[in-house]
Interface confidence: low
Amino acid sequence: TGADTEAVVCVGTACYTAHSGKLSAAEAQNHCNQNGGNLATVKSKEEAQHVQRVLAQLLRREAALTARMSKFWIGLQREKGKCLDPSLPLKGFSWVGGGEDTPYSNWHKELRNSCISKRCVSLLLDLSQPLLPSRLPKWSEGPCGSPGSPGSNIEGFVCKFSFKGMCRPLALGGPGQVTYTTPFQTTSSSLEAVPFASAANVACGEGDKDETQSHYFLCKEKAPDVFDWGSSGPLCVSPKYGCNFNNGGCHQDCFEGGDGSFLCGCRPGFRLLDDLVTCASRNPCSSSPCRGGATCVLGPHGKNYTCRCPQGYQLDSSQLDCVDVDECQDSPCAQECVNTPGGFRCECWVGYEPGGPGEGACQDVDECALGRSPCAQGCTNTDGSFHCSCEEGYVLAGEDGTQCQDVDECVGPGGPLCDSLCFNTQGSFHCGCLPGWVLAPNGVSCTMGPVSLGPPSGPPDEEDKGEKEGSTVPRAATASPTRGPEGTPKATPTTSRPSLSSDAPITSAPLKMLAPSGSPGVWREPSIHHATAASGPQEPAGGDSSVATQNNDGTDGQK
């Protein structure tokens, strides 16, 4: 699908063109780019009105559209992987031609956060409504489309072309037709301003080929910031009409001579320019000599002028242009200062947030506050940061040091703590004995008991578990002599295994291990090897495991 230029609006130092055609955002940008422009910016309410005007022009010429809502790409995009920033007017989007984050925005609805794919913005037009100030086109964010799949309901796009300056449209003093050809390859017979380097073709006469005269002009920069056609006097003048046709092509007054000839003149306070058509104010400010947002202020008796800058800007060396003042040089912020056009903003380092006494102050974020702690167990807030700690029987783990991992006391550096069987539990351990042995009152040693061929002696009673003093962590796994269904041993969710002292006589019998709270009870046989897998909560090794693992505080441990 191609794209047709249907409409053009030139104002200030920019031209906007509107095109119809179902293109992806990249194809639309490429189309604008080929002619030296970009997808249009909408950086202010005024610019939104210019864009709306060119769209209205396009829609007036377009065969009536049957869609009530229509979308047109503009140059606002967010790259893949860049996330939404709700604090900014552009929400983390940026203009394709570059430039600052601008204060104006007109979002259609609340944006959903998604960093996965590239997102592009289109103007959403309600074609059923007149163009009212309250109905400036809304910004709609969505997928950027692709060739052959341009995006849902995209009708076209708007380009913007920027120029050094503009010429006034040529004025005709008699019948004729002007055709302007712009540097961005648009032809038009009616432009309110004609961009620098445009060509004008003037065909005089009422259409009879014999009478037609042609003139060709180029919009040139005559002097710094002064643009004109280099023509003198009204074009296509005819004694038949004199001043009666289009005021003789004169900007202000037209004076007729008796022979049908005429001259252009100006009202008091104005002077006739070199083109002998246009009038300019004698007021030196009327030529808008000040640039970059500077205001022209007349001197005494209206003879000279000075330029004045808005707050946050200062005059440059030319004394005509305003440049941004870098307020950050005065260190107005407690931590970070970001210079912006006409101002600045204070930001806080990671671990701090705006607040506290004074402008631009930052205060510590209490990461350990209720409901926001990133730690699995203990959390200590520090200035600008925090650190996590673990209860007895656990050590810090995880890439970010926020998780707590069970210490496997059964494979501790001092060797086994139990004389015979050692059962590691979440945050603790306890000892057991082989058949024919019973656990001594110290909970560690085994003493010879009555001869039995049953399973190993189970866990001690509640009151004589070998738990470490002061441990408040509930035991996550216990050993039990009971067999599984049909006597079949099953896998267990815990990665810690009961260990056997290597010199003890072994009688194999399955033990029921209860999974951590919230997980199904599953089965595993005791092992004669010391545990080699990391103990504590761990993801199942893969596959379709039905075992759920969970931290003891129920958090996912993400900081």
Epitope: Q49, T66, R68, S128
Partner: antibody, heavy 120, light 111 residues
Framework: QVQLQQPGAELVKPGASVKLSCKAS????????MHWVKQRPGQGLEWIGE????????YYNQKFKGKATLTVDKSSSTAYMQLSSLTSEDSAVYYC?????????????WGAGTTVTVSS | DIVLTQSPASLAVSLGQRATISCKAS??????????MNWYQQKPGQPPKLLIY???NLESGIPARFSGSGSGTDFTLNIHPVEEEDAATYYC?????????FGGGTKLEIK
Amino acid sequence: QVQLQQPGAELVKPGASVKLSCKASGYTFTSYWMHWVKQRPGQGLEWIGEIDPSASYTYYNQKFKGKATLTVDKSSSTAYMQLSSLTSEDSAVYYCARSVYYGNKYFDVWGAGTTVTVSS
Amino acid sequence: DIVLTQSPASLAVSLGQRATISCKASQSVDYAGDSYMNWYQQKPGQPPKLLIYAASNLESGIPARFSGSGSGTDFTLNIHPVEEEDAATYYCQQTNEDPRTFGGGTKLEIK
């Protein structure tokens, strides 16, 4: 050529309802909005409301909400306006008129009008 | 609602002369460079006919002796030179805001 055809007259009793029709021809019916305008004898023009034939969206002048109901039949390219609970105040000529779909919605084609007389 | 006041209510103009009809809006009907003001002509027993749209654009098929001008709140319809067939009532209409409203009309007689 582009035409909007309306029946010449309707005579109705007070309290009754009437459904006026406006048949479009010579253009794509769903590409233009259809408006209805009231003109009392010797008086000016009053806009009643508009309907988008493609999706049946309607916008009404608050003054006529509850009095007029606009509908369309796309298959016959006909727009309708039902007037309910008629009184002598509703005696008028009712015009249908089309407008472009976007921007300045001036009425470029008008029907000849239907004269509604409310009388017992 | 935007109220449109037309003046004069009626006028009589000699054949070949200029007829000027004014329409004042209670608030601006301009937006982004366009004026949402339209002019219609209505003859007895006939529907209104579009003459001028967007303040100054001549509808196709309308003679060039009809012209419109103005912006904001003040608009004018000019007919020059007036012809016999121009005897009618002329209405201005704004389409900038709902409800669309019409002026009270100006009756033009040819002397």
